[in-house]
């Protein structure tokens, strides 16, 4: 569950559940910074614009990131 904050981390809870790349509107990867010491991944779904914080350590999420980057590299000339 993400919370908007100017300081500190955004994600309050994280999900290990795999997400279908085709149902993704947007995938934000927020690198660790002075505000939050960990990487955060926030998925925005096409349906209702629902958001979900994903666990960067989860195997399913790592596979999702690979699939998304592969999809992007296909699209870019």
């Amino acid at each position: 569950v993400p919370l908007s904050r100017t300081v500190r981390c955004t994600c309050i809870s994280i999900s290990n559940q795999p997400v279908n790349p085709r149902s993704l509107e947007k995938l934000e990867i927020i690198p660790a910074s002075q505000f939050c010491p960990r990487v955060e991944i926030i998925a925005t779904m096409k349906k209702k614009g629902e958001k979900r914080c994903l666990n960067p350590e989860s195997k399913a999420i790592k596979n999702l990131l690979k699939a998304v980057s592969k999809e992007r590299s296909k699209r870019s000339p």
């Epitope: 569950v1 981390c9 559940q17 010491p37 209702k48 958001k51």
Partner: antibody, heavy 121, light 109 residues
Framework: QVQLVESGGGVVQPGRSLRLSCAAS????????MHWVRQAPGKGLEWVAL????????YYADSVKGRFTISRDNSKNTLYLQMNSLRAEDTAVYYC??????????????WGQGTTVTVSS | EIVLTQSPGTLSLSPGERATLSCRAS???????LAWYQQKPGQAPRLLIY???SRATGIPDRFSGSGSGTDFTLTISRLEPEDFAVYYC??????????FGPGTKVDIK
Amino acid sequence: QVQLVESGGGVVQPGRSLRLSCAASGFTFSNCGMHWVRQAPGKGLEWVALIGFDGINEYYADSVKGRFTISRDNSKNTLYLQMNSLRAEDTAVYYCARDWPEGYYNGMDVWGQGTTVTVSS
Amino acid sequence: EIVLTQSPGTLSLSPGERATLSCRASQSVSSSYLAWYQQKPGQAPRLLIYGASSRATGIPDRFSGSGSGTDFTLTISRLEPEDFAVYYCQQYGSSPPFTFGPGTKVDIK
């Protein structure tokens, strides 16, 4: 099954301290934000505090800020509420509740049975 | 701080009737952030609705939620004997506190 069990409640004098515990089982505790919510006798629900899944984020209701501290031990699957400088108005049933992670906000989907704190001289 | 107001305070109805509970926010709440809970005497609350309109796991379809902005509604299409309880709305805005409404008691007429 998914379960939260609170303990540590009791009768305490004003100004004294108490520590509540909440033991979690049946789910990946280290993925979930956790809340404390209280309910004074015959009254409604009052959100008390929230801690992020890894303990980095902590948030408090104004009524307890500076007196209560929420913490967690993911290796023990346990949530805590340290309550200092207790007042009569802190008398309530204290519930721990899970912040469901599979969505933007799915509410508090699992609750403990509650532990009673009575502050009285 | 967002303040939630629930009306009516008490709703006296008979089994089989339709119940309409209102929750009004002092400022706009994203519908993603509005939940409804049911609480019976001596029990912990139970999540019914999240995201203003999505039913939680295992919640019967006679419960439905709607609304946006500052006005939200919980509807119980046909009251069953086990539905007589207190109902709370809660907002989970972009910053704490995550306030609850004062509750609506649904009791048997």
